[in-house]
Structures are given as C-alpha cells and as structure tokens.
C-alpha cells in the first residue's frame, strides 16, 4: 500500500505528488488532502484564530493592548476570565502565519510574565518562573516541485508532506531550576 | 479529487474504504494510512508512552508509587526535575489505551493536586486551583464495517476515519473563579 499523501503518477511512485497551480485553490492544499473527517477547525490552535483576529480587529478600533506586559491580577476580574487570564503564569495567544503550512494560521501561546503572579500581592514574583507547555500538532507542509521531471521548480506547483510541529499551548508556573 | 482516507471501491465512493482482516497488520491501521511523513512517534503524547511504560516497569520492581498524591518537590530536587515536577500545579502522565484508535496508546496528563503548591510553605493551598490544559490531537479511529454491502459487519473488517481528540498536556495554576 502507498502513503495517501504520496499518491502520484507512476514515475513519482513513493514521492510526494506534484500539484499544478490549476489543481490548487488559491495556492492552498488540494481539498482531498485536507481529510474531510479530520475537521481541522476543531483543533484548538486553529479554532482560536478567528476569535483572536476578531478581537484584534476590535482592539484596533478601541484602545491599544498592553497584552505583552505581565498583568496585575485583580480578584474581581477573575470571575469571568478564561484559564489563560486566571493563571498565575498568564499567557496570550498570538496568530502565527506560515504561507507554506496548512493550516496557515495557528494560535501560539506566549507567556506574559517571566516570573509568576504572587496571589498574595497580585504582582509578579521572580521566585517562580512561567514556562511554556508545548504540544505536537500535525500539519501539512508545501514545497515547490517540478512537474516535468527536470528538477527545476514549476511555477505555482507544489508537493505536500505531513509533519509534526511544536505548538506552545499555554504556560505553567514552576520552581526555578537554578538561581 | 477524493479524500485520501476515503479511497475505496467505486461502489463505496465517498465513504470510508472497508479493509479486510488480511489487509490489516494485527488489527491495526493499514500502513498507507499512517502517512509516512507524519512521523507519529514525534507527537509528544506518543513519544512519552515508551518512557512511561519503562518507568512503570521499573517501579513495579522497585517501590510502590505515591504518584496520585499532591507532592512537594524538595528544594534539592528542584535543580534536576522536569517541568511537570517543578510546576506548582504538578502533574503525572498516564498511558491511555484505546484499541480502536491509532495511536492506541497516548500519554494523558493528570493534575496531582486539587489546589497548587504554596511556594512559601511547600504545602498545597486551596486558595489556588490546578487545572488541566487541553490540546487537540489528530488520531485515526476504526469502526467495524461491511465488505459485502449487506450492512452487517464483516468479522475482522474495519473502516478508518480521522478525528481530533482533546488530550490533557499539562496543568496550570489559576485563581479560582469563585471563592
């Protein structure tokens, strides 16, 4: 049996199929590679993108964000906040864009503090450290390819392969390894 | 174009292909579905399984584990400990097994404390909560299927589809929503 991502012409047997520009909608991955059952939109780093972009659009018309600063946690703000805001190692999500990857846009977590929030004071303490938690995500990667066997890339033609990438999904508060 | 996971005989066009027992090595997914480029072993919940099983085997010949208790990391242990042990919302990994899933074995994180470790006292405090961080992982799911079109499952025959499942990857320490 042959890898479903490697279905090509007989002469490219066992190598990624090279798709022409005509076969690729807007330069993205061919629909049959985006396995219908996979429901990519369910993946958290994908699902978060639209809400992040909407929030970013609102903020541009609102006030500038101080999201990259380590916040002061106030008890009254905790009641409605999400995990990433209630955490004493809080994080924000950044949209990471890669034109040669599917999904092209993924939400990456970024710790907002080097230390953690001391719950007694609501302020950052250096006695603890915020560290990212990484997870693996399966993505499709595209590369230019040759359709005529010459080895020279054919304009607009791409081959696709799968790979796991490390995606930061949140932050946890740890005792520092060394001072 | 057709979904690579849906490549079947003409009469099953657009539905998952039904594989016979002979086509399936030891009842697992057909090799060509386990996309060569995907390198499943790189996925963290997969990669952790072998080390966890080895550690579990060692522990059975060693002393019983108190891994489900909320631990306190000793100051001298902080220097060499891993993130899941140094976290003030520590967790352990449990091997989750599902015969009808590929990968069949995945490492799921489980918080060891209901609260978090107070970095001042070294004791668990209920003033904070440990919560799991969930991530999506793409897996293959198998279901019994019919090879003769009767609708009755053919013994040993399976169809496969992809789905995202939520995998707990670690724990973070949060201010509780309500006091």
């Amino acid at each position: 049996h042959q890898d479903p991502f490697l279905r090509g012409h007989p002469h490219t047997h066992g190598t990624p199929r090279c798709y022409s520009a005509e076969e690729l909608p807007l330069g993205q991955a061919p629909p049959h590679l985006l396995a219908r059952g996979a429901k990519w939109g369910q993946a958290l780093p994908v699902a978060l993108v639209s809400s992040l972009e909407a929030a970013g659009h609102r903020r541009r018309h609102d006030r500038p964000s101080a999201a990259t600063q380590c916040p002061v946690l106030r008890p009254e703000e905790v009641l409605e906040a999400d995990t990433h805001q209630r955490s004493i190692s809080p994080w924000r999500y950044r949209v990471d864009t890669d034109e040669d990857r599917y999904p092209q846009k993924l939400a990456f977590a970024e710790c907002l503090c080097r230390g953690c929030i001391d719950p007694r004071t609501g302020r950052e303490t250096a006695a603890l450290n915020s560290v990212r938690l990484l997870q693996s995500l399966l993505v499709l990667r595209r590369r230019p390819c040759s359709r005529d066997g010459s080895g020279l890339p054919t304009p607009g033609a791409f081959a696709f392969h799968t790979e796991f990438i490390r995606v930061p999904v949140g932050c946890t508060c740890v005792l520092p390894r060394s001072v | 174009h057709q979904d690579p996971f849906l490549r079947g005989h003409p009469h099953t066009h657009g539905t998952p292909r039904c594989y016979s027992a002979e086509e399936l090595p030891l009842g697992q997914a057909p090799p060509h579905l386990l996309a060569r480029g995907a390198k499943w072993g790189q996925a963290l919940p997969v990669a952790l399984v072998s080390s966890l099983e080895a550690a579990g085997h060692r522990r059975r010949h060693d002393r019983p584990s108190a891994a489900t208790q909320c631990p306190v990391l000793r100051p001298e242990e902080v220097l060499e400990a891993d993130t899941h042990q140094r976290s003030i919302s520590p967790w352990r990994y449990r091997v989750d097994t599902d015969e009808d899933r590929y990968p069949q074995k995945l490492a799921f994180a489980e918080c060891l404390c209901r609260g978090c470790i107070d970095p001042r006292t070294g004791r668990e405090t209920a003033a904070l909560n440990s919560v799991r961080l969930l991530q999506s992982l793409l897996v293959l799911r198998r279901r019994p299927c019919s090879r003769d079109g009767s609708g009755l499952p053919t013994p040993g025959a399976f169809a496969f589809h992809t789905e995202f499942i939520r995998v707990p990857v670690g724990c973070t320490c949060v201010l509780p929503r309500s006091v």
Partner: antibody
C-alpha cells in the same frame, strides 16, 4: 512580635555532642521551612541544614551529613539540632532562620545565635 | 571557597553611594534575579535587606537597592549613613552538595 530564640550552645570536647534548640513565636511556625546557619569566628555565613514545615523532609550540607540531625516539634513551636562527633571546625555561632520561600535562601527572620565552641 | 565572589571591603563617606558586587555563574546568579542580601552588624544576627534581586522587605530603607547585570548581582546603598557600617552578604541557591551558598562577605566602612 515575630522572633526566633536559640539556646543550648556551650563548650564541648572534640567527639562530644550538643543539642541546640530554637523557640519560635509571633508567627505560624508549622507553615515554614526552617534552616540552621552557622558562622565561624571572623568568617562568613555557612548554611548547615533545613527541615520542612511538617518535619518530614530534612537536608544537610556535606560538611555535617551523618553527624548532625535536625528536627522540630510543631506543637511546641520548637526546632532542634542534635550535633554529634563534634570537631574543632564546627566551632561557630549557630543561627536558626525562617525561609520566606521554602526552596530559596531568603531567610527573613533570624535568631540572635548561640555559640558552640569545640575545644579540648 | 564560596561560589559567590564579593569584594572583601568597600568604603565611602556619609552621603555618598556605594555598590557591592556579587559575582556568580550563568547557572546561578545569571539565570534568574533571585539573589538575596543580608546586613550584619558586629555581634548581631544577619538581617534580610533585599530578596528576589531587587525587592525590599518592609522596614528596610529605600536607600538600599538591588540589581543584576549578567552574572553579577549588586547591592547599592545611597546616602550612606554611619549606621550602614556592617558586613554584607549575598546568597543564592547552590547545588545538591551545598544547597544554599553565601558570598564571602564585604565589610563596609563609612569614613569620617
């Protein structure tokens, strides 16, 4: 007010034993890790040992391991250091000190110290 | 031998500022801003002056401040006063062998 008071120091011959005590008041003693720290005459500070808040965990500097034993009685708000096989180089003022973070050398409350002299 | 290196002595006149350095390695002082500083008057117990590199416990004068650059932590005393004359020690976490380490100490002399 918050305080630690050491006692039990004195003159002892090499190879002898001594038991130091540290009485705590003004704070919840059972919530804190406590350390013993010593200072030889005219020298700097040297960390000796810690004990966890519950007393279940102890740790010692290499220089005293196997000779000194730290213990506590939370019901009596008291800390102890049993010193055996004493050597001349153990001569020092011994301080008990409270750790403000259990895993860091932030000693926010100190006793006044008790002098231990090991001499023949 | 101390893992943290301090100058044996520093001096300054009343009203001046002085700085005491505490040099470690990239794996101790350099990694995190977690050095603490202690003041010790002759015949007295040490007193915590700075923790987490730059924080002052309540009751400590704001003339005392801490900072870090690279592998060196520093204690700065501004507006020097006669009562600041004392020994000063920095402290850090060490290794499994010596869990907590102190610098060798610096004798501060206030001139005049």
């Amino acid at each position: 007010q918050v305080q630690l008071v050491e006692s039990g120091g004195g003159l002892v011959k090499p190879g002898g034993s001594l038991r130091l005590s540290c009485a705590a008041s003004g704070f919840t003693f059972s919530d804190h890790y406590i350390s013993w720290i010593r200072q030889a005459p005219g020298k700097g500070l040297e960390w000796v040992s810690y004990i966890s808040s519950s007393g279940s965990t102890t740790y010692y500097a290499e220089s005293v391991k196997g000779r000194f034993t730290i213990s506590r009685d939370n019901a009596k708000n008291s800390l102890y250091l049993q010193m055996n096989s004493l050597r001349a180089e153990d001569t020092a003022v011994y301080y008990c000190a409270r750790q403000s973070y259990y895993f860091l050398p932030y000693f926010d409350v100190w006793g006044q110290g008790t002098l231990v002299t090991v001499s023949s | 031998q101390s893992a943290l290196t301090q100058p044996a002595s520093v001096s300054g006149s009343p009203g001046q500022s002085i700085t005491i350095s505490c040099t470690g390695t990239s794996s101790d002082v350099g990694s995190y801003n977690l050095v603490s500083w202690y003041q010790q008057h002759p015949g007295k117990a040490p007193k915590l002056m700075i923790y987490e590199g730059s924080k002052r416990p309540s009751g400590v004068s704001n003339r005392f401040s801490g900072s870090k650059s690279g592998n060196t932590a520093s204690l700065t005393i501004s507006g020097l006063q006669a009562e600041d004359e004392a020994d000063y020690y920095c402290a850090s976490r060490g290794s499994r062998r010596v869990l907590y380490v102190f610098g060798g100490g610096t004798k501060l002399t206030v001139l005049g």
